[in-house]
C-alpha cells in the first residue's frame, strides 16, 4: 500500500482510496488504494464510503472487480462475472 497520509474516515481520502488500518502500526489508519485486479482482499471489507473506522488493512476492490475466493482462505480481486 502507498502511504498517502494518516486518516480516520474514508471521507478524508481521495477517490479510489479508503481509510484502512496500517499494516505496520495497527493503531494508525492510512489512505490506501482500493484493490486492483489480482490484489488480496476480504469479502466483508466495508464498501466505500464507510462512515466508521475500518478494522481491515485492505480496501474493497475497485468498481467492476469483486472479491472472490480462489482457495479455502484466499480471496483476490477479480473481474465481476
Amino acid at each position: 500500500a502507498v502511504i498517502t497520509g494518516a486518516c480516520d474516515k474514508d471521507s478524508q481520502c481521495g477517490g479510489g482510496m479508503c481509510c484502512a488500518v496500517s499494516i505496520w502500526v495497527k493503531s494508525i489508519r492510512i489512505c490506501t488504494p482500493m484493490g486492483k485486479l489480482g490484489d488480496s482482499c476480504h469479502p466483508l471489507t466495508r464498501k466505500v464510503p464507510f462512515f466508521g473506522r475500518r478494522m481491515h488493512h485492505t480496501c474493497p476492490c475497485l468498481p467492476g472487480l469483486a472479491c472472490l475466493r480462489t482457495s479455502f482462505n484466499r480471496f483476490i480481486c477479480l473481474a465481476q462475472k
Partner: antibody, heavy 121, light 111 residues
Amino acid sequence: EVQLQQSGPEVVKTGASVKISCKASGYSFTDYDMHWVKQSQGKSLEWIGYISCYNGATTYNQKFKGKATFTVDKSSTTAYMQFNSLTSEDSAVYYCARDGNYGEAYAMDYWGQGTSLTVSS
Amino acid sequence: DIVLTQSPASLAVSLGQRATISCKASQSVDYDGDSYMNWYQQKPGQPPKLLIYAASNLESGIPARFSGSGSGTDFTLNIHPVEEEDAATYYCQQINEDPFTFGQGTKVEIK
C-alpha cells in the same frame, strides 16, 4: 436518543407477501447500515442480511435470497423488508438492527422492538 | 456456513459468582489479527442487546462485569460478579464470513 420503531404484528395467508417497516430516529440515518434478523418461536437468531442506508446496496444471506427484499426511504429515515411467498416457516419475530459502524465487526448496537409475523393457511 | 456451538445450554449461578459461557466455531473467525465474534444478551419479550464486539470490546454503557475473550475458534463470555438483572439468554455471533451466524444460546438463571 437512537430509536428504531417497527411496524405492528402481521397475520397473513400462505403465499401472500408482507412489508415490515423500521423507522429510525436520533442519528444520521445514512451513516449506518441496517440489518434484519429472524427469530422463530423459542429459537435462536438468524441473520437475513443488511442494507446500506446511504446508497441502498444490499447483502443477503443466501438462504433468504428471493424471499426477502430490503429497501430504504431516506426522506422518511425508514428501512423496509418485504417477505414474499410466505409459508408457515416464515412465522417468526423479525428485528431491524442498526450496524454500530465498528469496522468489519458488523455489530448490531440498536434494535427495533420486533415485528411478529404469523402465516396462517 | 460457520456453526457456533455454545455451552452449556443453561446454567444456574449464585448471586455474586462467576458465569462462564463458551462459544466454539466450526472454523476460525480470526482475520488480520482480530477476532470477529460478538456477544448479545436477550431477555424474554425484548430484542437482543449488544454486550461485546470483536471478541473483547465492551459496548458503551455495558457494565464492566461483562468481559469477552478468545481467538480462533474458542471464545468465552464471563460475567462476574453476576447480578439479578443478568438472568437472560446469551448469544455469540460470528461476523468473519457471510452468512453471519449465531450460536443456539445459553440461558443463565440466578440462584
